[in-house]
């Protein structure tokens, strides 16, 4: 997260760290007791490493009573996701067992009504991604409030030049932005999960290159079918 600040500890109990061989790789969001939603591209970076999900964490390194690392029973990328595009960049991870819920571990309601968030709406994005252009990684969860950007502006040639489909949304990126390592994490508007950070190799913090988020409402049928 660029231009953000440390999150209040455990105030986002849905927040997950998707890890490979014990290292944070991507963000994720607990959407059901045994399921974490993330970005499909995160799996590509995992190679053949052991994928696990950390829940109940604020600090990645310090011991915390609520922290628990779960093995992944099943990884389900969206069937239409492709390495060379950010389309359908969603991944569902089934935990090896149901998460132990509590004040620091709780699923987040996700948007089912397929309607665009009003441009200008302030939404919260959180993650353990880099906090500087130099690539500094935080130990503790960071967050930032970002205004939603209308799709027409996001599709301008100087922004994303027509690449933003109706199944994506954009948020402003003027120094405050999601960045590398935040992919798969949640964009939360009004207490509801609206978007998942896409995992393209986008420049961060440049206002002409807005953050791109996969709209979960557009994938309600797929999410329901996997969780069923």
């Amino acid at each position: 997260i660029l231009g953000g600040r440390e999150a209040e500890a455990h105030a986002r109990p849905y927040m997950a760290s998707v890890q490979v061989n014990g290292e944070h790789l991507c963000g994720g969001v607990l959407v059901a007791e045994q399921w974490v939603l993330s970005a499909a591209h995160c799996l590509e970076d995992a190679a053949d490493g052991k994928v696990q999900v950390l829940l109940g964490a604020h600090s990645l390194s310090q011991p915390e009573p609520s922290k628990r690392l779960y093995d992944v029973l099943r990884a389900v990328p969206h069937p239409d996701s492709r390495p060379d595009t950010i389309d359908h960049d969603l991944l569902l991870l089934q935990l090896s067992e149901k998460a132990t819920l509590g004040p620091a571990v709780r699923p987040l309601p996700w948007q089912r009504v397929d309607r665009d968030v009003e441009p200008g709406t302030l939404c919260d994005v959180a993650g353990w991604g880099i906090v500087s252009h130099a690539g500094r990684r935080p130990d503790r969860l960071q967050h930032v409030l970002l205004p939603v950007l209308d799709r027409a502006t996001c599709n301008r040639r100087t922004h994303h030049d027509g690449a933003i489909t109706q199944r994506m949304m954009c948020a402003e990126s003027n120094r405050r932005d999601s960045c590398k390592g935040d992919s798969g994490g949640p964009l939360v508007c009004g207490g509801v999960l609206e978007g998942v950070v896409t995992s393209g190799s986008r420049v961060c913090g440049n206002r002409k290159k807005p953050g791109i988020y996969t709209r979960v409402a557009s994938y309600a049928a797929w999410i329901d079918s996997v969780l069923a």
């Epitope: 441009p119 209308d150 027409a152 502006t153 301008r156 040639r157 100087t158 027509g162 440049n206």
Partner: antibody, heavy 116, light 112 residues
Framework: EVQLVESGGGLVQPGGSLRLSCAAS????????INWVRQAPGKGLEWIGD????????DYNADFKRRFTFSLDTSKSTAYLQMSSLRAEDTAVYYC?????????WGQGTLVTVSS | DIQLTQSPSSLSASVGDRVTITCRSS???????????LEWYQQKPGKAPNLLIR???NRFSGVPSRFSGSGSGTDFTLTISSLQPEDFATYYC?????????FGQGTKVEIK
């Protein structure tokens, strides 16, 4: 299939007004800016300006700001170019074009002739 | 406003010829985001322009590989490696980096 269709061109007297329409289909109208470009007979392309179909924000080439106005009817997926105080040098084919990707999609153009 | 000057204004060539059109901008057209929004369009008489090249050198989908773009800063080139009968048209460069966006005056490619 993305389509832009202009209409409203024709013969108009100097000092007169005209409203051109650009009807969009095959995509969600509010997802892309509409730009207007004109081309005088035998001449090059000239950018008039653009409009954001969700916010209504506009940007005009300074040469056209006083006499030309953009508007929208999103329920009809249509953009409009209102032209006033027309003069002979405004005689041109007027195009609308969608921005994104680049100017990949254009209308067929509509000819405006300003003459007495 | 940024001026784009194309040369030559017109040229005569034969099928199979290699054709090069240049476009020079009055100032740099590198955008603040680091990208250069220099595009090339082809226009045939009575028709709307067709997008050929985006961001200096990226061919738009469906554009034949004989069309290529290059350049940086203020000097840009469109090359047609082997001119085909359907390539006789007018070509325009365009900059979208700075408002007002502007077109070059055009280069007409005619049959020799």
């Amino acid at each position: 299939e993305v389509q832009l269709v202009e209409s409203g061109g024709g013969l108009v007297q100097p000092g007169g007004s005209l409203r051109l329409s650009c009807a969009a289909s095959g995509y969600t109208f509010t997802d892309y800016y509409i730009n207007w470009v004109r081309q005088a007979p035998g001449k090059g392309l000239e950018w008039i300006g653009d409009i954001n179909p969700i916010t209504g924000d506009t940007d005009y080439n300074a040469d056209f700001k006083r006499r030309f106005t953009f508007s929208l009817d999103t329920s009809k997926s249509t953009a409009y170019l209102q032209m006033s105080s027309l003069r002979a040098e405004d005689t041109a084919v007027y195009y609308c074009t969608r921005e994104g990707p680049s100017f990949a999609y254009w209308g067929q153009g509509t000819l405006v002739t300003v003459s007495s | 406003d940024i001026q784009l000057t194309q040369s030559p204004s017109s040229l005569s060539a034969s099928v199979g010829d290699r054709v090069t059109i240049t476009c020079r901008s009055s100032q740099t057209i590198v955008h603040s985001n680091g990208d250069t929004y220099l595009e090339w369009y082809q226009q045939k008489p009575g028709k709307a322009p067709n997008l050929l090249i985006r961001k200096v050198s990226n061919r738009f989908s469906g554009v034949p590989s004989r069309f290529s773009g290059s350049g940086s800063g203020t000097d840009f080139t469109l090359t047609i490696s082997s001119l085909q009968p359907e390539d006789f048209a007018t070509y325009y460069c365009f900059q979208g980096s700075h408002v007002p966006v502007t077109f070059g005056q055009g280069t007409k490619v005619e049959i020799k």
